[in-house]
């Protein structure tokens, strides 16, 4: 049969709050060396526990008795610590345990988890989490809005998770934790009703410099709106907003627009240009969330200014005119250049030269047109810039360059087909 | 000296129920915590769970839990183990184990067979 | 759970040759427990507290180890020896053992 439990006394029980601090103990008596008291918690060794043994030789000789206790501090209870506990030693070849003490926790409820600030649209359901637990159990939840109990009585309402079908104001809402100890109120957490994200953002009308947009404002509770916020991007770079990056890759152009009416003329764009563009609006609250960005296109302008340098000069039947692309911006792609050219007496003669931007003409008759003028105008998709002021033929002198060009015959009759968006020019030689 | 003796060996169809005991003599029952450890064929060591015969309470394995149940007679020093809804897997050997923070003594096995 | 994975899976030996069997935990660990198993039998402690000797076991038994990293050592290896071993760990619950290693004669 077993040897006699060297043990003579054995841990107690602790109940208490969380938080408490309580400490176990534990005494044996035993002959000869005195051995390594261990605690165990539902069964297992406490390999880190805040332990202390004490040793008194109960007479001269280390073979006599000694007595030892062994003291477990606990020092702020939590529901890990509960369990029963028992002090194990090791004699010779034999293993003892005390009998066991009992470590509970029992108080008012603990929150596991609060409700969380957060920030939502009007009209938009969402939910908030509560939990909370004992000992000793049940715990029952009763959720406040703002102060104002949500159910007749704890545990009838919603427990854990609460949904809210919609809020059209700012509100405050926290949870009671009620069990047999006592009630326990949770953070109170402040809902605030932001505008919601708005609606159909779309282009009113385009110039090549400036894009008229409109939206439609989501609902903002009881808080008018005080403007919307656009802003726009050039989108040649920006492969992040196509991939759905919440953030432009550059710094946006923002401009504010009072509201109503909802739509804004955005302007000194660049034309020809591509450009993405989001709306947000903002009540007293705060801003809405973004719309997601709308790839939008500024149009082509015309030239905003006639093509530079340009020579015309004279021998003979023939004319040699030459010049440069136009120093002002271009709002587009130069498609081609036009070129009129206009004796005294004679009329206005209109040619598309295309992309060149040189040409020799060949006079009608003997080139003996007086007062021979020319007029150059670069020309986009979106029509003609403006004309150039005419430029007399200069006769040419013996040691002026002329180079060869495929010559362009005056035909009989100017007879040019425009479209109709392409303005005729309005010089006077 | 401590011994741990466990009843014989089962077999049992998919679906039922098996019930092990382990008698414990040479120390003291109620003090020391009893633990079902099995081993399937040819496998490691699975620890099932553990009942502290002093007051009854028990703890389980995750693995094992509703379908596990411990209980004890301190007055004949028997533990047992209940397995219920037994499937072709639980088929192996289940060991009683007296244990202090480890286990330093074990029965010898029961050979439990679940097959149709 | 903590996992221990010993090593290695078999280890073949003569006898009077030096063992030494290894187990690492997935986790730092307090204690690691060792256990001897041969055919038909329950396993039987050797080890206790990763370095006590158990009642019963020869002194020629030792383990040591700290942290993720343990070994049981067996310094001359007697006939008797050649089982299988199982490390053994309850700083967590639930208590967890290794796979095995299978201590063969060479």
């Known amino acids: 049969q077993a040897e006699e439990s060297p043990f003579v006394g054995n841990p107690g029980n602790i109940t208490g709050a969380r938080g408490l601090t309580g400490t176990l103990r534990c005494q044996l008596q035993v002959q000869g060396e005195p051995p390594e008291v261990h605690w165990l918690r539902d069964g297992q060794i406490l390999e880190l526990a805040d332990s202390t043994q004490t040793q008194v030789p109960l007479g001269e000789d280390e073979q006599d008795d000694w007595i030892v206790v062994s003291q477990l501090r606990i020092t702020s209870l939590q529901l890990s610590d509960t369990g029963q506990y028992q002090c194990l030693v090791f004699l010779g070849h034999q293993t003892f345990v005390s009998q066991p003490g009992y470590v509970g926790l029992e108080g008012l409820p603990y929150f596991l988890e609060e409700p969380e600030d957060r920030t939502v649209a009007a009209n938009t359901p969402f939910n908030l989490s509560c939990q909370a637990q004992g000992p000793p159990e049940p715990v029952d939840l009763l959720w406040l809005q703002d102060a104002v109990p949500l159910a007749t009585a704890p545990g009838h309402g919603p427990q854990r998770s609460l949904h809210v079908p919609g809020l059209n104001k700012t509100s405050s809402f926290s949870c009671e934790a009620h069990n047999a100890k006592g009630v326990t109120t949770s953070r109170t957490a402040t809902i605030t009703v932001l505008p919601q994200q708005p609606r159909n953002l779309h282009l009113v009308s385009r110039q090549p410099t400036e894009l008229e947009v409109a939206w439609t404002p989501g609902l903002s509770g009881i808080y008018p709106l005080t403007h919307c916020t656009l802003q726009a991007v050039l989108s040649d770079d920006g492969m992040g907003i196509q991939a759905g990056e919440p953030d432009p890759p550059e710094e946006p152009l923002t401009s504010q627009a009072s509201v109503p009416p909802h739509q804004l003329r955005l302007g000194s764009l660049h034309p020809h240009t591509p450009y993405h563009i989001r709306v947000a609006c903002t009540s007293s609250q705060g801003p809405s969330s973004w719309t997601h960005w709308l790839p939008v296109e500024t149009p082509e302008g015309v030239p905003l200014g006639p093509p530079e340098n340009i020579s015309a000069t004279r021998n003979g039947s023939q004319a040699f005119v030459h010049w440069q692309e136009p120093r002002a911006p271009l709002q587009g792609t130069l498609l081609g250049y036009r070129l009129a050219y206009q004796g005294q007496d004679t009329p206005e003669v209109l040619m598309d030269i295309g992309l060149r931007q040189e040409v020799t003409l060949e006079l009608q008759g003997d080139g003996s047109v007086s007062n021979l003028t020319v007029c150059v105008a670069a020309y986009t998709a979106a029509g003609d810039g403006p004309w150039s002021l005419p430029v007399p033929l200069e006769a040419w002198r013996p040691g002026q360059a002329q180079p060869v060009h495929q010559l362009v015959k005056e035909p009989s009759t100017p007879a040019f087909s425009w479209p109709h968006h392409h303005h005729h020019h309005h010089h006077h030689h | 000296q401590v011994q741990l003796v466990q009843s014989g060996a089962e077999v049992k169809k998919p679906g039922a129920s098996v019930k092990v005991s382990c008698k414990a003599s040479g120390y003291p029952f109620t003090d020391f915590y009893i633990n079902w450890v099995r081993q399937a064929p040819g496998q490691g060591l699975e620890w099932m769970g553990w009942?502290?015969?002093?007051?009854?309470?028990?703890k389980y394995n995750e693995k094992f839990k509703g379908r596990v149940t411990m209980t004890r007679d301190t007055s004949i020093s028997t533990a047992y183990m209940e397995l219920s809804r037994l499937r072709s897997d639980d088929t192996a050997v289940y060991y009683c184990?007296?244990?202090?923070?480890?286990?330093?003594?074990w029965g010898q096995g029961t050979l439990v067979t679940v097959s149709s | 759970e903590i996992v221990l994975t010993q090593s290695p899976a078999t280890l073949s030996l003569s006898p009077g040759e030096r063992a030494t069997l290894s187990c690492s935990a997935s986790s730092s660990i307090g204690y690691m427990y060792w256990y001897q198993q041969k055919p038909g039998q329950a396993p039987r402690l050797l080890i206790y507290l990763t370095s006590n000797l158990a009642s019963g076991i020869p002194a020629r038994f030792s383990g040591s180890g700290s942290g993720t990293d343990f070994t049981l050592t067996i310094s001359s290896l007697e006939p008797e020896d050649f089982a299988v071993y199982y490390c053994?760990?309850?700083?967590?619950?639930?208590?967890?053992f290794g796979q095995g290693t299978k201590l063969e004669i060479k």
């Open positions: 184990a007296r244990s202090t923070g480890f286990f330093d003594y």
């Open positions: 009942i502290y015969p002093g007051s009854g309470n028990t």
């Open positions: 053994q760990q309850w700083s967590s619950n639930p208590p967890t």
